[in-house]
């Protein structure tokens, strides 16, 4: 939602967190700003303090409950407001009617581990974190592998078009250090976006056996 010269973007992690970023052209003076969440059909409301992340950008997380509690559903609409202190009052700087399941961004996958490694292959598994049971199997993943001498940006993306929490990396070079990352996205939601990348998992392929092709 854009009001005046500001941009206000929020995502729901599908369970109990709404993360928001508010950017404003022309930095505000030292003033206190908050995000207020008012669901249309629930008794609770929530507030978080916006903290600067850059010259003209602020962010905060609305913690709606215990991490794995299902605080919102597909029918909920949450009025989100950016409020900034002016004198003793609050001024509404931006406002949006937020449909949580149209604006999803899940938590980064966790618990990455090497299940099995060989000279040219590596099997890796992971888990999704704080993802709603509503998705059932309607998730997709992207993975990337960092090879020596390359950057993450250069790494080709591997797409898994189903809820598959493992991958078998092929055609690897023996005795070589690699790093691996994965991210997740629900299929639902017009404005849904990819989760952040997972923490990289470092692994090393096995050296080739002398005089033997593995």
């Amino acid at each position: 939602a854009v009001n005046g010269t500001s941009q206000f973007t929020c995502f729901y992690n599908s369970r109990a967190n709404i993360s928001c970023v508010w950017s404003q052209d022309g930095a505000l003076q030292d003033t206190s700003c908050q995000v207020h969440a008012w669901p249309d059909r629930r008794r609770w409301n929530q507030t978080c303090e916006l903290l600067p992340v850059s010259q003209a950008s602020w962010a905060c997380n609305l913690i709606l409950g215990a991490p794995d509690s299902q605080k919102l559903t597909t029918v909920d609409i949450v009025t989100l407001r950016v409020l900034c202190r002016e004198g003793v009052r609050w001024r509404v700087m931006a406002i949006q009617d937020f449909k949580p399941f149209e604006n999803l961004r899940l938590m980064a996958p966790i618990s990455l581990q090497v299940v099995h490694v060989e000279t040219h292959r590596c099997n890796i598994s992971w888990e999704i974190s704080q993802a709603s049971h509503y998705f059932e199997r309607h998730l997709e993943f992207e993975a990337r592998t960092l090879s020596p001498g390359h950057t993450w940006e250069e790494a080709p993306l591997l797409t898994l078009k189903q809820k598959q929490e493992w991958i078998c990396l092929e055609t690897l070079t023996p005795d070589t250090q690699y790093e691996f990352q994965v991210r997740v996205k629900p299929l639902q939601g017009e404005f849904t976006t990819w989760s952040p990348w997972s923490q990289p998992l470092a692994f090393r392929t096995k050296p080739a056996a002398l005089g033997k092709d593995t």
Partner: antibody, heavy 121, light 112 residues
């Protein structure tokens, strides 16, 4: 119905202080801001500042800083405005007015009847 | 501080005729949230001010539809389509976009 009832007229000597009260009824006192506005005789309106009774937080117009103090007593839904070091130019009608804690639409919707303060030696 | 300048100072009008009051701000009063907090207050003789118009053109509850507000940026107008006897008094514009909030000097509407 919303009502703001102010204290009676005051006559003060230069250098003295005056404390004007504003008793609110018909709404939840701690949910709204109380602004203070003055009107010197035959002059326009001047916004002096305001207090949020919910937490006692105040904001004063720089023009009055150091001389004005706004307080409240939530137990009797009353706001106070004290002006010190009075001079003849402070002779005016002082109004309290209610305002929304979140400034979505307007600054002040309901006003008190005004308190006349005369500063004269 | 934002200076609000009203014209005319005095406005003699005939009952049933239209009236127009101008208010000019010394700087743009569009708030950084995109809204313009320009308000009009009416003060009848011997009474407290009363809110008429907020955010340039919105009538406050109970305000007759003969009152209308318009304008943008730095130039604003209050119009009374057909003046009635009860409209006599002083009209003030007010900006709530930039602290400290400020009033115009007032325009006195009287019957000819």
């Amino acid at each position: 119905e919303v009502q703001l009832v102010q204290s009676g007229a005051e006559v003060k000597k230069p250098g003295a202080s005056v404390k004007v009260s504003c008793k609110a009824s018909g709404y939840t006192f701690t949910d709204y801001v109380i602004s203070w506005v003055r009107q010197a005789t035959g002059q326009g309106l001047e916004w002096m500042g305001e207090i949020y009774p919910g937490d006692g937080n105040t904001y004063y117009n720089e023009m009055f800083k150091g001389r004005v103090t706004m307080t409240r007593d939530t137990s009797i839904s009353t706001a106070y405005m004290e002006l010190s070091s009075l001079r003849s130019e402070d002779t005016a009608v002082y109004y309290c007015a209610r305002g929304s804690y979140t400034y979505d639409n307007y600054a002040m919707d309901f006003w008190g009847q005004g308190t006349t303060v005369t500063v004269s030696s | 501080d934002v200076v609000m300048t009203q014209t005319p100072l005095s406005l003699p009008v005939t009952l049933g005729q239209p009236a127009s009051i101008s208010c000019r701000s010394s700087q743009n009063i569009v708030h950084s949230n995109g809204n313009t907090y320009l308000e009009w207050y009416q003060q009848r003789p011997g009474q407290s001010p009363r809110l008429l118009i907020y955010k340039v053109s919105n009538r406050f509850s109970g305000v007759p539809d003969r009152f209308s507000g318009s304008g943008s940026g730095t130039d604003f107008t209050l119009k009374i389509s057909r003046v009635e006897a009860e409209d006599v008094g002083v009209y003030y514009c007010f900006q709530g976009s930039h602290i400290p909030w400020t009033f115009g000097g007032g325009t006195k509407v009287e019957i000819k």
